[in-house]
């Protein structure tokens, strides 16, 4: 019986190929050149090894590359990738969008996993900030991501970057991370005129002041109440009534079905009756 | 510094009215920003919102409770009043004062004062 | 009325334990949604407003987070004064409703 750990005679693998899929574990590890693995890496997506040959082929990088892969091999990790911890996934350096992109792919259609989200917090925080092209690409892979990220991680968004937001991105954001995006927000679209500007600020007015609020009023925007809803609560607590039907347009008659509900209720409780009565939708302060 | 403090009686018969009052101390019962609300808890249970009131006298009661419960204020004395008809044993709780700042939730309680409702 | 249910009702745990308590609401409320600690004999306390807020005076351990109908409190690492229960409460809708409550016991 050969010895386990010696690879038995004519089976040292020349080249990364099917032919590896009969191998057994031991064989594989006494048979596969690391460094044959690494430069092949593209092969292995092809070959339908089993998750313990996988393992094995995971063990073989780790021991080549203790201190993290190189990107040339990461960059072609296919389904490997989904074989990686987070603490794994901690030494890496992958600048390459090209790279994100590959190995996003590959968990394509399942939520974030640990691994995906170490590896986008190591890409993010190896380029500085997250731009234009690296929120394109996570948004894409992942809708909700924007909103995953804490205030603090959201201040390094420069405002070319938020043309890049879709409403859907905005979605499950919560009023502190509106707090942040807003401002950036109305940096980025500073140049559009008032009904293209509406468009394009209106999924981040949840973090939109008061003075803010009274300006889009004059501009005839006809914010619809799904909008109004998401307005944060102490923006809307001083508009006058008149502003409030400026600024809803038609829709101010979608009041009503809301006016037990935050922030209506709050803005209708703090309104003069007589005021409301203006409405004439039976609003009771 | 803001604080609340309930007062009123520990014992009520059943079929009787019970009647509470918060003080408002270190602050104002007419501020824009809050409302004051009545919040019970029947003992080993949870918490129960009964309704609040503003300033202005507007008032919002728990459905459930809304046919027994009238909730006053009293701006010039710096207190709000509960007011909780045709009690029967199931009332007996420990009943709270509460403000409700606008941008945040129940964010000062008074001490709470135990009813118990029995003849 | 909005019913909002949490879970688990209660829970054993050690100091240093990282403790997660979910609350659900019967339908969306947007971010209005608030958490109290109660500890025996005491009123409520405001930890967490609007989901995520963390109210001035409470410790960073205490985390909240979520946003429609699914939220989640947070103690990164519990001591020994947040053995106490927990309570949701929903502000959306002027029938403001509460949780059930989930009491952290020490393990």
């Known amino acids: 019986e050969v010895e386990k750990t010696a690879c038995p005679s004519g089976k040292k693998a020349r080249e990364i190929d099917e032919s590896l899929i009969f191998y057994k574990k031991w064989e594989l590890e006494a048979c596969v050149d690391a460094a044959l693995l690494a430069t092949q890496m593209d092969r292995v997506n092809a070959i339908p090894f089993t998750y313990e040959q996988l393992d094995v082929l995971k063990h073989k990088l780790d021991e080549l590359y203790p201190q993290g892969y190189p990107e040339s091999v990461i960059q072609h990790l296919g389904y490997l990738f989904l074989k990686m911890s987070p603490e794994d996934i901690r030494k890496w350096n992958v600048t390459s969008l090209e790279t994100l992109k590959a190995l996003l792919e590959v968990n394509k259609g399942h939520e974030m996993s640990p691994q995906v989200a170490t590896l986008i917090d190591r890409f993010v925080k190896g380029r500085g900030q997250l731009d234009k092209d690296t929120l394109d690409t996570l948004t894409a892979f992942y809708p909700g991501y924007l909103c995953s990220l804490s205030p603090e991680e959201l201040s390094s968004v420069p405002p070319s970057s938020i043309w890049a937001v879709r409403p859907q991105d905005l979605d499950t954001c919560d009023p502190r991370q509106l707090d942040v995006l807003y401002p950036k927000a109305r940096l980025a679209f500073q140049n559009m005129n008032g009904s293209e500007y509406f468009v394009k600020i209106q999924s981040f007015l949840g973090g939109a002041p008061t003075e803010d609020l009274k300006a889009l009023s004059q501009q005839n925007v006809s914010m619809d109440l799904a909008t109004f809803m998401k307005l944060r609560t102490d923006a809307v607590l001083p508009l006058t009534v008149a502003e409030v039907q400026k600024l809803l347009g038609p829709h101010v008659e979608g009041l009503k079905a809301e006016e037990r509900h935050r922030p209506v209720r709050d803005w209708i409780l703090r309104q003069r009756q007589d005021d409301l009565d203006t409405l004439g939708l039976g609003l009771q302060g | 510094q803001v604080q609340l403090q309930e007062s009123g009686p520990g014992l009520v018969k059943p079929s009787e009215t019970l009647s509470l009052t918060c003080t408002v101390s270190?602050?104002?019962?007419?501020?824009?920003?809050?409302?004051w609300s009545w919040i019970r808890q029947p003992p080993g249970k949870g918490l129960e919102w009964i309704g609040y009131?503003?300033?202005?006298?507007?008032?919002n009661y728990n459905p459930s409770l809304k046919s027994r419960v009238t909730i006053s204020v009293d701006t010039s004395k710096n207190q709000f009043s509960l007011k909780l008809s045709s009690v029967t044993a199931a009332d007996t709780a420990v009943y709270y004062c509460?403000?409700?700042?606008?941008?945040?939730?129940?964010?000062?309680w008074g001490q709470g004062t135990m009813v118990t409702v029995s003849s | 009325d909005i019913q909002m249910t949490q879970s688990p009702s209660s829970l054993s745990a050690s100091v240093g334990d990282r403790v997660t308590i979910t609350c659900r609401a019967s339908?969306?409320?947007?971010?209005?949604l608030n958490w109290y600690q109660q500890k025996p004999g005491k009123a409520p306390k405001l930890l967490i407003y609007?989901?995520?807020s963390l109210q001035s005076g409470v410790p960073s351990r205490f985390s909240g987070s979520g946003s429609g109908t699914d939220f989640t409190l947070t103690i990164s690492s519990l001591q020994p004064e947040d053995f106490a229960t927990y309570y949701c409460?929903?502000?959306?809708?002027?029938?403001?409703?509460f949780g059930g409550g989930t009491k952290v016991e020490i393990k």
């Open positions: 509460a403000r409700d700042f606008v941008l945040s939730g129940f964010d000062i």
């Open positions: 270190g602050g104002s019962v007419s501020s824009f920003t809050d409302t």
């Open positions: 009131i503003y300033y202005s006298g507007s008032t």
């Open positions: 339908q969306s409320i947007s971010s209005y």
């Open positions: 609007a989901a995520s």
């Open positions: 409460q929903q502000s959306y809708d002027a029938s403001y409703t």
